[in-house]
Interface confidence: low
């Protein structure tokens, strides 16, 4: 019969014959022959291969380097790589999460619109009229001004986007 020019899925062409690929989690030791099957071996500890393959070396699990602010989110297996994430208070600088940076704080006058996650930075928004923030924070939203009326007080000092209103007693007319 004619030697094949293409092979089925999960096979590869070598020396004019189709050999089975190694399954995920295993590496190629020797190609198949007319008389023998493809020989595969499991990846070692801290190694993986995530596809049907003919690789002679497994890939090393990613190292979640604490020097870059990383830690393990999910340990790797023989078929999957380790997934890194950032330390609390930090977020990844890229989709691959190869290093981390500190979450941004929102300055006084600005509040947190969206708290940062392991993959996205803090989103700040200016405090609108009627709200204030007097701290630099990665968590605090803008707070509403105190309602003097509900406390039977009057506004003695107007609020700003950075300060609360100051309430004081109402002037009582003497009899």
């Amino acid at each position: 019969p004619e030697p094949p020019t293409a092979c089925r899925e999960k096979q590869y062409l070598i020396n004019s014959q189709c050999c089975s690929l190694c399954q995920p989690g295993q590496k190629l030791v020797s190609d198949c022959t007319e008389f023998t099957e493809t020989e595969c071996l499991p990846c070692g500890e801290s190694e993986f291969l995530d596809t049907w393959n003919r690789e002679t070396h497994c890939h090393q699990h990613k190292y979640c380097d604490p020097n870059l602010g990383l830690r393990v989110q999910q340990k790797g297996t023989s078929e999957t790589d380790t997934i890194c994430t950032c330390e609390e208070g930090w977020h990844c600088t890229s989709e691959a999460c190869e290093s981390c940076v500190l979450h941004r704080s929102c300055s006084p006058g600005f509040g947190v619109k969206q708290i940062a996650t392991g993959v996205s930075d803090t989103i700040c928004e200016p405090c609108p009229v009627g709200f204030f923030s007097n701290v630099s924070s990665a968590f605090e939203k803008c707070h509403p001004w105190t309602s003097c009326e509900t406390k039977d007080l009057v506004v003695q000092q107007a609020g700003t986007n950075k300060t609360d209103v100051v309430c004081g007693p109402q002037d009582r007319l003497r009899a």
Partner: antibody
Framework: EVQILETGGGLVKPGGSLRLSCATS????????MNWVRQAPGKGLEWVAQ??????????YYTESLEGRVTISRDDSKSRVYLQVSSLRAEDSAVYYC??????????????WGQGVMVTVSS | EIVLTQSPTTMAASPGEKITITCSAS???????LHWYQQKPGSSPKVLIY???NLASGVPVRFSGSGSGTSYSLTIGTMEAEDVATYYC?????????FGGGTKLEIK
């Protein structure tokens, strides 16, 4: 019981070199990142070098002040780590500690220490 | 490199006294990478507190640690004679790993 024993120290002339050896037992050496930390007489601690494990391709790191004069290596079959220092200067005189570095995916710290070996550089 | 500055450099305390040693970092580090070591006279250092506030195995509960960002501290609730030692903070946040200059604690 964890044991770490450093050897190879002593008196060396300026410009000379030495090889410190560290024999270990009682913990999983092959998984550990191994380090040398030194302490000059009456002074504080200074990290010198680190060698990571096989899983991390035995990557090596050195303190800048010794870069180019120092080499760290390891022999997993013997659970030993070595430090080769060349072009020695008087300021290299110190107790050299061999220490393992614990890594659990969250943080590293020096968990086991040897008793140290004294190196004196003097003519 | 991250420089760690400890204070005080030396101090003497009476038994039963509360002690606080501070460690200031030249740049912000995650609290997971700040550790404390104790070195008794003539001995090797040993880890005392790891990741800012976790007591290492066998360490008495009178020791505690706290802090974040650039400011960290080690506290001994009630000083005992056996606590005479030099204490070092250390950061594992970035290479080169660095230690504070040490705080020598003596007994009055």
């Amino acid at each position: 019981e964890v044991q770490i024993l450093e050897t190879g120290g002593g008196l060396v002339k300026p410009g000379g070199s030495l090889r410190l050896s560290c024999a270990t037992s009682g913990f999983n050496f092959n998984d550990s990142f191994m380090n040398w930390v030194r302490q000059a007489p009456g002074k504080g601690l200074e990290w010198v070098a680190q060698i990571r494990n096989k899983n991390y391709n035995y990557a090596t790191y050195y303190t800048e002040s010794l870069e180019g004069r120092v080499t760290i290596s390891r022999d997993d079959s013997k659970s030993r780590v070595y430090l080769q220092v060349s072009s020695l200067r008087a300021e290299d005189s110190a107790v050299y500690y061999c220490t393992s570095y614990y890594y659990d995916g969250f943080a590293d710290y020096f968990d086991y220490w040897g008793q140290g070996v004294m190196v004196t550089v003097s003519s | 490199e991250i420089v760690l500055t400890q204070s005080p450099t030396t101090m003497a305390a009476s038994p039963g006294e509360k002690i606080t040693i501070t460690c200031s970092a030249s740049s912000s580090i995650s609290s997971n990478y700040l550790h404390w070591y104790q070195q008794k006279p003539g001995s090797s250092p040993k880890v005392l507190i790891y990741r800012t506030s976790n007591l290492a195995s066998g360490v008495p509960v009178r020791f505690s640690g706290s802090g974040s960002g650039t400011s960290y501290s080690l506290t001994i609730g009630t000083m005992e004679a056996e606590d005479v030692a030099t204490y070092y903070c250390q950061q594992g946040s970035s290479i080169p790993y660095t230690f504070g200059g040490g705080t020598k604690l003596e007994i009055k």
